[in-house]
């Protein structure tokens, strides 16, 4: 039976130009995490194996960055970042957990006005 | 003035589906995010899913994901939503709503689409 | 998913009266960078519902000094300093700062 939970950094608003921390944490379970995915939409970001350790996609290697933890920096945001973000975690035994950020990225303009904005 | 517009009321019978539509003028359509929302028995509010007219992204509540479907035309700054394989439990009140930008609320509303499924 | 639990679910007031709203989540609706995304929405019969309150505290744009909001964390309350006609409807609170978001289960705002 799957009894873990996953916590995350929680929805996101961020200006364009600046950087952001996805994380999530498996909880409630002592199941053994083999993999994390981070995918957006049906794009995968990167992996972090248990025994290989990170991988980036090529396409996204300038502006992600591993850590810290199984988390992934996003760097350098874009208007075209805005959307839903998942981490993907492969377990054993449970079998997969997945967690949801979505991320909104604003022009600074709307900065001004808006949220406390979220720039590490 | 935000103004969004929605399709007419829906009688739909029960296994088909249907499509519902929603026009915003007033604000620069591709900039802020759009919501779905139903409402149900007079009452309670769901909250169904959202889309990026930007980059036509989509995020749905797990409940929904399969049922509704998404979409947006930006040349007619238009959001729509399609509902497949309607029973009497999708009967309800369903609503647009404009995300305000930076805070994860909803700040301008459609008038809200009463759909009825029934034999 | 965050479950959103307001109180009362019926709220019977006179014209004048000061009233309180609680909405209380399952988990806490501050995100790892400071930002709480709660709001408050007043649904009245046969319109839309209109947003009041957005991020805890800010009043949206034309709606009256009346209407304020606090809290943090998984508690958050709503007030009217003095309730008039146009108030009475069914009042939400929104969480979106988990996926999914989520709605409170109302709470109606009727005369006595």
């Known amino acids: 039976m799957m009894t873990g939970t996953i916590e995350t950094t929680g929805n996101i608003s961020a200006e364009k130009g600046g950087s952001i921390i996805l994380q999530c944490h498996l909880s409630s379970t002592t199941a053994q995490v083999t993999q994390v995915n981070w995918e957006q939409q049906d794009q995968l970001l990167a992996i972090c194996n248990a025994d290989l350790g990170w991988h980036i996609s090529p396409s996204f290697k300038d502006r992600v960055a591993p850590g810290p933890g199984l988390g992934l920096t996003l760097q350098s945001l874009t208007v075209n970042d805005t959307g839903e973000y998942f981490c993907i975690y492969h377990t054993y035994p449970d079998g997969t957990y997945t967690g949801r950020i979505f991320l909104e990225v604003l022009e600074s303009s709307v900065a001004e006005h808006g949220a406390r904005f979220q720039i590490p | 003035e935000v103004q969004l517009q929605q399709s007419g009321p829906e009688l739909v019978k029960p296994g088909a589906s249907m499509k519902i539509s929603c026009k915003a003028s007033g604000y620069s359509f591709i900039d802020y995010i759009m919501n779905w929302v139903k409402q149900s028995h007079g009452k309670n509010l769901e909250w169904i899913g959202l889309?990026?007219?930007?980059?036509?992204?989509?995020s749905y509540n797990q409940k929904f994901k399969g049922k509704a479907t998404l979409t947006v035309d930006k040349s007619s700054s238009t959001a729509s939503m399609e509902f497949l394989s309607l029973t009497s439990e999708d009967s309800a009140v369903y609503y647009c709503a404009r995300g305000l930008r930076g805070y994860y609320a909803m700040d301008y509303w459609g008038q809200g689409t009463s759909v009825t499924v029934s034999s | 998913d965050v479950v959103l639990t307001q109180t009362p679910l019926s709220l019977p007031v006179s014209l004048g009266d000061q009233v309180s709203i609680s909405c209380r989540s399952s988990?806490?609706?501050?995100?790892?960078?400071?930002?709480?995304?709660l709001s408050w929405y007043l649904h009245k019969p046969g319109q839309s519902p209109q947003l009041l309150i957005y991020g805890i505290s800010n009043r949206f744009s034309g709606v009256p000094d009346r209407f304020s909001g606090s809290g943090s964390g998984t508690d958050f309350t709503l007030k009217i300093s003095t309730v008039k006609p146009e108030d009475l409807g069914m009042y939400y609170c929104l969480q979106g700062t988990h996926q999914p978001w989520t709605f409170g289960g109302g709470t109606k705002l009727e005369i006595k």
């Open positions: 988990q806490s609706l501050t995100n790892s960078y400071g930002s709480t995304f």
């Open positions: 889309i990026i007219p930007y980059n036509g992204g989509t």
